[in-house]
Interface confidence: low
C-alpha cells in the first residue's frame, strides 16, 4: 500500500495522526468495526496532550475510545501497553460494576462527560473517535 | 529500580495453609496489577493469579481456583496470596511479577507440600 | 484456554550464531507476546513485550516478530552469557499461559 501522508477529507489532523469524530452513537463493537473499515482504530490515548485534544473535540459527551477488557486484561486496539501507558480514570474507575441489570460487567472505556474515563456495558449506543497514523502504509480494503 | 521480594514460602502438609508475601518498591505500586507464577522443580512456568491496581479485578488459574485467594494493601506496597487446602502438586517455586506483560520479577519463594 | 508451544524444546549452536525460537499460539493473540530469558539462580528478566517491543536495557541483539498465531525470538549473535532458557507467555487473555520452554546451550 501507499504511505498516507495527509488526512482523509472531514478528519482532523494532530501531531501527525488524523481523527474523525462521530456525530451518532454505536455500541462499542460496531464503533470498532466502523473505524477498522476505515482503516483506522478506535482512539488510542498515549499522553495527557492527546487526552486534552481530544477532550476538546468532544465536549462534554459519553465518547468510546480503542480500550476494552473483553478478555480479562486491560487492551488497547491497537496493542500500546496498558500498564505502564497514560491514564486518566475517574475516581475508583474502573469497577466493572454488575449492578446495572444488563447482564455481565463493564468491559469497554470512554470519555465520561469531564474527560475522565469510565468503563461501561460495551452495548450503549455512544459517541466515537476513531484515530489513523499519517506515514503508516495505507493496506487496501479486503475485498468481500 | 523497580524491586520485588517474596517471602512466606517453607514446607506445610497436604490440606494446610500458607500465606505468600510480595514486597514492592521503585514503583507507584497501586498503578499496577500485579501477577503470581510458579514453577514447580525442573518443570515450565504456570500463571497462578492477577490482581488490578485497585483489587477490583481478580483472576485466578483453574488449578487453584477456590483454594488460593489474590490480595493487595497499597497503603503497605505489598501482595499477598493466601493458600488454602495445599497439595503435593502446588509444590513450586512462587513468583511475584508486575503487569499482564510479566515486565519485572521477584527471586522466588519455596513452597513445598509434603507429608 | 490459549495453548503454547515452542520449538525446538532445545537447542546447541556456537558462539556468534544467529539463534531463532519459534512460538505459537493455539489462537489468534494479535501482539499480546512476551518473552523471557531464565537462568539459574536469577529473577526470570523480560526481554519482549508486545511480540516485538524492547524491554528497556536489553541488548539490541535480542528482536522479536510474528502477529496473530506465529511469533519469533533472535538472537543476532549468540554469546556465552545467552546461555539461559527462554519462553514466550501470551497475556491476551485469561488464564495467561506460557510456552514450554526452549533450553539454549552450547556446542
Known amino acids: 500500500g501507499s504511505e498516507r501522508t495527509c488526512c482523509p477529507v472531514n478528519w482532523v489532523e494532530h501531531e501527525r495522526s488524523c481523527y474523525w469524530f462521530s456525530r451518532s452513537g454505536k455500541a462499542w463493537a460496531d464503533a470498532d468495526n466502523y473505524c477498522r473499515l476505515e482503516d483506522a482504530h478506535l482512539v488510542v490515548v498515549t499522553s495527557w496532550e492527546e487526552q486534552k485534544f481530544v477532550q476538546h473535540h468532544i465536549g462534554p459527551v459519553n465518547t468510546w475510545m480503542g480500550l476494552h477488557d473483553q478478555n480479562g486484561p486491560w487492551k488497547w486496539v491497537d496493542g500500546t501497553d496498558y500498564e505502564t501507558g497514560f491514564k486518566n480514570w475517574r475516581p475508583e474507575q474502573p469497577d466493572d460494576w454488575y449492578g446495572h441489570g444488563l447482564g455481565g460487567g463493564e468491559d469497554c472505556a470512554h470519555f465520561t462527560d469531564d474527560g475522565r474515563w469510565n468503563d461501561d456495558v460495551c452495548q450503549r449506543p455512544y459517541r466515537w473517535v476513531c484515530e489513523t497514523e499519517l506515514d503508516k502504509a495505507s493496506q487496501e480494503p479486503p475485498l468481500l | 529500580e523497580v524491586q520485588l521480594v517474596e517471602s512466606g514460602g517453607g514446607l506445610v502438609k497436604p490440606g494446610g495453609s500458607l500465606r505468600l508475601s510480595c514486597a514492592a518498591s521503585?514503583?507507584?505500586?497501586?498503578?499496577?496489577?500485579m501477577n503470581w507464577v510458579r514453577q514447580a522443580p525442573g518443570k515450565g512456568l504456570e500463571w497462578v493469579s492477577s490482581?488490578?491496581?485497585?483489587?477490583?479485578?481478580?483472576y485466578y488459574a483453574d488449578s487453584v481456583k477456590g483454594r488460593f485467594t489474590i490480595s493487595r494493601d497499597n497503603a503497605k506496597n505489598s501482595l499477598y496470596l493466601q493458600m488454602n487446602s495445599l497439595r503435593a502438586e502446588d509444590t513450586a517455586v512462587y513468583y511475584c511479577?508486575?503487569?499482564?506483560?510479566?515486565?519485572?520479577w521477584g527471586q522466588g519463594t519455596l513452597v513445598t507440600v509434603s507429608s | 484456554d490459549i495453548q503454547m508451544t515452542q520449538s525446538p524444546s532445545s537447542l546447541s549452536a556456537s558462539v556468534g550464531d544467529r539463534v531463532t525460537i519459534i512460538c505459537r499460539a493455539s489462537?489468534?493473540?494479535?501482539?499480546?507476546l512476551a518473552w523471557f530469558q531464565e537462568k539459574p539462580g536469577k529473577a526470570h528478566k523480560s526481554l519482549i513485550y508486545?511480540?516485538?517491543s524492547l524491554r528497556s536495557g536489553v541488548p539490541s541483539k535480542f528482536s522479536g516478530s510474528g502477529s496473530g498465531t506465529d511469533f519469533n525470538l533472535t538472537i543476532s549473535s549468540l554469546q556465552p552469557e545467552d546461555l539461559a532458557t527462554y519462553y514466550c507467555?501470551?497475556?491476551?487473555?485469561?488464564?495467561?499461559?506460557f510456552g514450554p520452554g526452549t533450553k539454549v546451550d552450547f556446542k
Open positions: 490482581i488490578s491496581g485497585s483489587s477490583s479485578y481478580t
Open positions: 508486545g511480540a516485538s
Open positions: 489462537q489468534d493473540i494479535s501482539n499480546y
Open positions: 507467555q501470551q497475556y491476551h487473555s485469561y488464564p495467561f499461559t
Open positions: 511479577a508486575r503487569v499482564a506483560a510479566l515486565d519485572s
Open positions: 521503585g514503583f507507584t505500586f497501586s498503578s499496577y496489577s
